[in-house]
């Protein structure tokens, strides 16, 4: 007789990351009897929703339901039907929606309301849609990577389960770059966190953590580009903007109305004698870097030390995982290797930005031109942000690990968010049973 497989005693969870440029749905899975163990939850699916971020639906909220359909249907397929009703669904919106809410609380609320109504139509256990704070985004990203790296496990292991593991219990810092904001989160070394807004206290698995975090709204890669363009067009003599952050030969027409369609460019707003201007790329890394640095106000600091714009930043400590757009951009540029020094990265960026646009288009024929055209800016921005913004040095650069996935799960805030909301990270260390760490064997 054939052996009948025992039903898997597993649980599932769904988190939608409603970012500024797009929405992604993540499905997580874990053994039901090991909920409180560290490192047992893993990602089984990522579905990228086709279209822009949800904040772009403010004038067409009735289209949100259709927008979410494909990925929600995918979730219906991946998760066994018997599990649907007990699978929690969470949607967290980040900086794109924070910016919309700055403009109007009602507009942001209307978008979320339609999102909630759409997600409630599925057979899952919908738990709500909300705009998470920048502090939460930083904190959950930090929890995610340290959970996946096994940093919360009290058992020291004689072998490494992930490439970045240094086999000690020192946590990794988290560097997250989105389209509209960027987060820096880490445990400083015996340093008082001078600004209460940037201090978090956690007790996880029986250990206390004093964590520094800050989210820089408007300093995600897309909003930083809008800021830079708004700043530079102020001093342009006509409707041509010769831009060092785009490849030589690149041309693009920008509507002034689009430039000022974000709260992030308000400080640079002025009446221009034209409705449109043309970006003409000149591809010069050094000039691009200089232009980007003008977005960081480093002249004012009310603390012992700051990142930029008067925001407290303690001395950097330990290793850092840099994920989301930090990883995607550096991966495209082939600069994620641990062996590549900061000087080498800068050298490669100089060469890349100087390459003619026609040559770039030929070399990367499969990449959408909109994205392809912005890698010079994005790469330069990442270097500027890490070096001048966060004060990494050529020496400390080797402590930055560009991470896409850890153990098959995407690095990002969504896993930490779900772990928290499902109470899967206990404050105290669970009583160990002989099988509690069998997953490592």
């Amino acid at each position: 007789t054939q052996n009948k497989a025992l039903p898997e005693n597993v649980k599932y969870g769904i988190v939608l990351d409603a970012g500024s440029s797009h929405t992604s749905l993540y499905i997580y899975k874990w053994p039901a009897e090991k909920e409180n163990d560290t490192g047992v939850v893993h990602q089984v699916e990522e579905c990228r929703v086709k279209g822009p971020g949800i904040s772009k639906f403010v004038q067409k909220v009735n289209e949100i339901g259709i927008y979410l359909t494909d990925c929600m249907e995918r979730a219906r397929e991946v998760i066994p039907r018997s599990q649907h009703q007990e699978t929690p669904v969470y949607l967290g919106a980040t900086a794109g929606m924070r910016l919309l809410r700055m403009e109007s609380e009602e507009l942001a609320d209307r978008v979320l309301d339609v999102v909630e109504r759409s997600l409630s139509n599925y057979p899952f256990d919908f738990q709500g849609a909300r705009i998470i704070t920048g502090q939460e985004e930083g904190a959950y990203g930090w929890i995610t990577i340290n959970y996946l790296l096994g940093k919360f496990s009290q058992k020291t292991r004689w072998f490494s389960i992930v490439p970045y593991e240094t086999n000690n219990q020192e946590t990794f810092g988290a560097l997250d770059l989105g389209g509209a904001s960027t987060q820096v989160t880490f445990v400083p070394q015996n340093q008082t966190i001078e600004s209460p807004d940037n201090a978090l206290q956690f007790r996880l698995y029986g250990k206390d953590y004093n964590v520094y975090t800050h989210s820089f709204l408007c300093y995600g890669k897309d909003q930083a580009l809008w800021q830079k363009l708004a700043k530079d067009i102020q001093v342009a003599s006509n409707e041509i903007l010769r831009d060092p952050c785009f490849h030589p030969g690149y041309k693009k027409v920008v509507n002034v109305s689009d430039l000022y369609k974000t709260p992030c460019t308000k400080r640079f707003e002025m009446t221009l004698p034209f409705q449109q201007f043309e970006i003409q790329g000149i591809g010069n890394y050094q000039q691009c870097h200089q232009s980007i640095l003008e977005l960081f106000n480093t002249s004012y600091c009310p603390y012992s030390q700051c990142a930029f714009n008067g925001i407290f930043l303690p001395p950097l400590q330990g290793d850092f995982g840099a994920f989301s757009a930090f990883y995607f951009v550096m991966k495209f540029l082939n600069l994620t290797s641990e062996k590549v020094s900061q000087e080498k990265v800068t050298e490669m960026m100089k060469k890349f930005c100087a390459q003619p646009w026609e040559e770039i288009k030929t070399s990367y024929a499969g990449v959408k031109e909109k994205y392809l055209s912005e890698y010079c800016f994005s790469g330069t921005y990442i270097l500027s942000l890490l070096l001048q913004g966060y004060h990494f040095t050529a020496d400390s650069w080797e402590h930055i690990h560009f991470i896409g996935k850890i153990q098959g799960s995407d690095a990002g805030w969504t896993l930490g968010y779900m772990l928290n909301l499902t109470n899967m990270i206990p404050a105290e260390q669970p009583l160990s049973t002989p099988l509690s760490h069998s997953t490592y064997v």
């Epitope: 904040s55 403010v58 004038q59 919309l100 809410r101 700055m102 403009e103 109007s104 609380e105 009602e106 507009l107 942001a108 609320d109 209307r110 109305s257 000022y260 369609k261 974000t262 709260p263 308000k266 707003e269």
Partner: antibody, heavy 123, light 106 residues
Framework: EVQLVESGGGLVQPGRSLRLSCAAS????????MNWVRQAPGKGLEWVSS????????SYADTVKGRFTISRDNAKNSLYLQMNSLRAEDTALYYC????????????????WGQGTMVTVSS | DTVLTQSPASLAVSPGQRATITCRAS??????MHWYQQKPGQPPKLLIY???NLASGVPARFSGSGSGTDFTLTINPVEADDTANYYC????????FGQGTKLEIK
């Protein structure tokens, strides 16, 4: 002190056009959404159009959609209402009004109003 | 459109007494309801925003309550200077106003 001063009203024949202006002062204009609200003689208030602070959201009442166009010039601290194909029922006192704020977030209520400019549509 | 119905259409209250005006929305508007006072020949003046928050410079005699579809503006105690038209306005959907309530002081 916040001030909103409307101008451009007057007597106009049905089918013709008129452009209203609102000059704002006493606050950072580009941080606030702006609106037009009207009041027919002896009647209640009727919202006409909104223009959010970063132009993410521009909206019109059904009664004026396709005929009226709201715009703003942040550098001139000015709000405008271009009114085309005017009808007798557009006769009203037109107020310029500023969006309020809920702490750090914008709100679609009206915390400051101008004195209004009268538009009379009659042959 | 979200229709707002104010009641009563008019009321007369003696000084020192309480005046209560209600506003009912044709659909839920969360807490996005606001109240204005308009005196003859003047533009409207904001009294209450987001159902219960007192606008700057408005006396504490004015208060607002409610959420969803039913909202109330209360003036307690009423003073002679409160003679005016009072309007509710919702902002959950594109803005709409109630038809107004005329308050007279006896």
């Amino acid at each position: 002190e916040v001030q909103l001063v409307e101008s451009g009203g007057g007597l106009v024949q049905p089918g013709r056009s008129l452009r209203l202006s609102c000059a704002a002062s006493g606050f950072t204009f580009n941080n606030y959404g702006m609106n037009w609200v009207r009041q027919a003689p002896g009647k209640g208030l009727e919202w006409v159009s909104s223009f959010s602070s970063s132009s993410t959201y521009i909206s019109y009442a059904d009664t004026v959609k396709g005929r009226f166009t709201i715009s703003r010039d942040n550098a001139k601290n000015s709000l405008y209402l271009q009114m085309n194909s005017l009808r007798a029922e557009d006769t009203a006192l037109y107020y310029c009004a500023r969006h309020g704020r809920y702490g750090g977030y914008g709100g679609f209520y009206f915390d400051y109003w101008g004195q209004g400019t009268m538009v009379t549509v009659s042959s | 459109d979200t229709v707002l119905t104010q009641s009563p259409a008019s009321l007369a209250v003696s000084p020192g007494q309480r005046a209560t005006i209600t506003c009912r929305a044709s659909e839920g508007v969360k807490s996005y309801m606001h109240w204005y006072q308009q005196k003859p020949g003047q533009p409207p003046k904001l009294l209450i925003y987001k159902a219960s928050n007192l606008a700057s410079g408005v006396p504490a005699r004015f208060s607002g309550s409610g959420s969803g579809t039913d909202f109330t503006l209360t003036i307690n105690p009423v003073e002679a200077d409160d003679t005016a038209n009072y309007y509710c306005q919702q902002s959950w959907n594109d803005p709409t106003f109630g038809q107004g309530t005329k308050l007279e002081i006896k």
